[in-house]
């Protein structure tokens, strides 16, 4: 047990939110972290898996409310798949509809967010500010 | 010891933050909320207070550096005293010099919050969504 | 890049009519291909997308109520639409159109010339 | 069903008048809004995408503006070759809709 080292008691009206790496944002137990150095889609990829976490997932409006008030451009991770014309997330699950409006601006495959639950097409290759997510079990 | 029914360990590598109210953004052990329904300033407060919290306050450009990212104005605890022209928090604190650019674009008393610290004078009597914070201890 | 279109014509009431889109100059399989028609003298009106690769998904206009169907053949770089019991009202030009990028299905910067389907007894 | 309402439905001017015509959505689309030019027999033309944005090979005198419900197509000077209909067209959501067209004709 030695990884742990803190004993804490929550009280019922109140309650603590995570666990996260420390100094991310913590929201309906959903770990958030903006990065403002630029990088392009892969390289924020990796910096976020480098922390234990994936590119920004978008996955309901209710849990992730908190993003609609998001200011700029930052990469999630959302990639087109060429071969059958849909978008998908880093683990693999299709963008279910009606979740972003995707906004066909740029030439790319890959997809910035943008605030009130809008996705900018853009080249994967440009550099972005981009935001990490790490759920909480 | 009957508030509380909850025991969790934290792992060192991560950590818990909090605690806020249900649902709250949990940011570097302050909790904040934004509310979308608009309500003059003396509205917004009553609503903060009775959540057990106060209108934002603005204290640190390093521990709130979400703030940077916040879209759209809301309002926030800051009040112009006639009487001496300061700007000061509800809690009776004045405004730290360089930590809010302060936009006169309308007559008033009150201040709304706007992106990259920047603080909007606004007429306290006019609609606006607010954000309210709680202060852990 | 071109789309070239092929079928039209007339036919009566209750009839079928197949219109095909030929792709050439870009890679088929990768794009969504969206039909559009239109009334003499009137505006344009969606009907319905089919993506050319393997999964072939397609999505229509609610008005379309199954009369009509989208098909593809990857290896002919082809789009079909299968215009079925048609009525005066489908009396249009219609043409093929395909987005600007791979990733759009939304906005068209290359269109078929149009053929004309008229339904009269 | 996303509805766009596209004004006025013609208009006459002359060559060299600053035209604007106007495509209204009944619900937000952000700025996924595209704007065609379509010549009598001829197939549509791709003018402004994503509500502002040229597309290549279009004159500049064409511009787009505007976000969430209200948007506007400008020809800041009228050519003749610009005596044409044009359509808004919402690129939010499926089922794609269209505004119904503005005829655009000699004065």
């Known amino acids: 047990n030695s990884l742990f080292n803190q004993e804490v008691q929550i009280p019922l009206t109140e309650s603590y939110c995570g666990p996260c790496p420390k100094n991310w944002i913590c929201y309906k137990n959903n770990c958030y972290q903006f990065f403002n150095e630029s990088k392009n889609w892969y390289e924020s990829q990796a910096s976020c898996m480098s922390q234990n976490a994936s590119l920004l997932k978008v996955y309901s409006k209710e849990d992730q409310d908190l993003l609609k008030l998001v200011k700029s451009y930052h990469w999630m991770g959302l990639v087109h798949i060429p071969t059958n014309g849909s978008w998908q997330w880093e683990d693999g699950s299709i963008l279910s509809p009606n979740l972003l409006t995707i906004i066909e601006m740029q030439k790319g495959d890959c997809a910035l967010y943008a605030s009130s639950f809008k996705g900018y097409i853009e080249n994967c290759s440009i550099p972005n500010t981009y935001i990490c997510m790490q759920r909480t079990v | 010891n009957s508030l509380f029914n909850q025991e969790v360990q934290i792992p060192l590598t991560e950590s818990y933050c909090g605690p806020c109210p249900k649902n709250w953004i949990c940011y570097k052990n302050n909790c904040y909320q934004f509310f979308n329904e608009s309500k003059n300033w003396y509205e917004s407060q009553a609503s903060c207070m009775s959540q057990n919290a106060s209108l934002l306050k603005v204290y640190s450009k390093e521990d709130q550096d979400l703030l940077k990212l916040v879209k759209s104005y809301h309002w926030m605890g800051l009040v112009h005293i006639p009487t001496n022209g300061s700007w000061q928090w509800e809690d009776g604190s004045i405004l730290s010099p360089n930590l809010l650019t302060i936009i006169e674009m309308q007559k008033g008393d009150c201040a709304l919050y706007a992106s990259s610290f920047k603080g909007y004078i606004e007429n306290c009597s006019i609609p606006n969504t607010y954000i309210c914070m709680q202060r852990t201890v | 890049q071109q789309l070239e279109q092929s079928g039209g014509g007339l036919v009566k009431p209750g009839g079928s009519l197949e219109l095909c889109c030929i792709a050439?100059?870009?890679?088929?399989?990768?794009?969504?291909m969206t039909w559009v028609r239109q009334a003499p003298g009137k505006g344009l009106e969606w009907i319905g997308c089919i993506h050319g690769g393997g999964s072939g998904t397609t999505s229509y206009a609610s008005w379309v109520n199954g009369r009509f169907t989208l098909s593809r053949d990857i290896d002919q770089s082809t789009g079909c639409l299968q215009l079925t019991s048609l009525t005066a009202a489908d009396t249009a030009m219609y043409y093929c159109?395909?987005?600007?990028?791979?990733?759009?299905?939304?906005?068209?910067?290359?269109w078929g010339q149009g053929t004309m389907v008229t339904v009269s007894s | 069903d996303i509805q766009m309402t596209q004004s006025p439905s013609s208009l006459s001017a002359s060559v060299g008048d600053r035209v604007t015509i106007t495509c209204q959505a009944n619900q937000d689309i952000s700025n996924a809004l595209n704007w065609y030019q379509q010549k009598p027999g001829k197939a549509p033309k791709l003018l402004i995408y994503a509500a502002s944005s040229l597309q290549s090979g279009v004159p500049s005198r064409f511009s787009g503006s505007g976000s969430g419900t209200d948007f506007t197509l400008t020809i800041s000077s009228l050519q003749p070759e610009d005596f044409a209909a044009y359509y808004c067209?919402?690129?939010?959501?499926?089922?794609?809709?269209f505004g119904g067209g503005t005829k655009v004709e000699i004065k």
């Open positions: 050439s100059g870009f890679d088929f399989s990768t794009y969504w």
């Open positions: 067209q919402q690129a939010a959501s499926f089922p794609l809709t």
């Open positions: 159109a395909r987005p600007g990028y791979r990733s759009w299905s939304k906005t068209f910067d290359l």
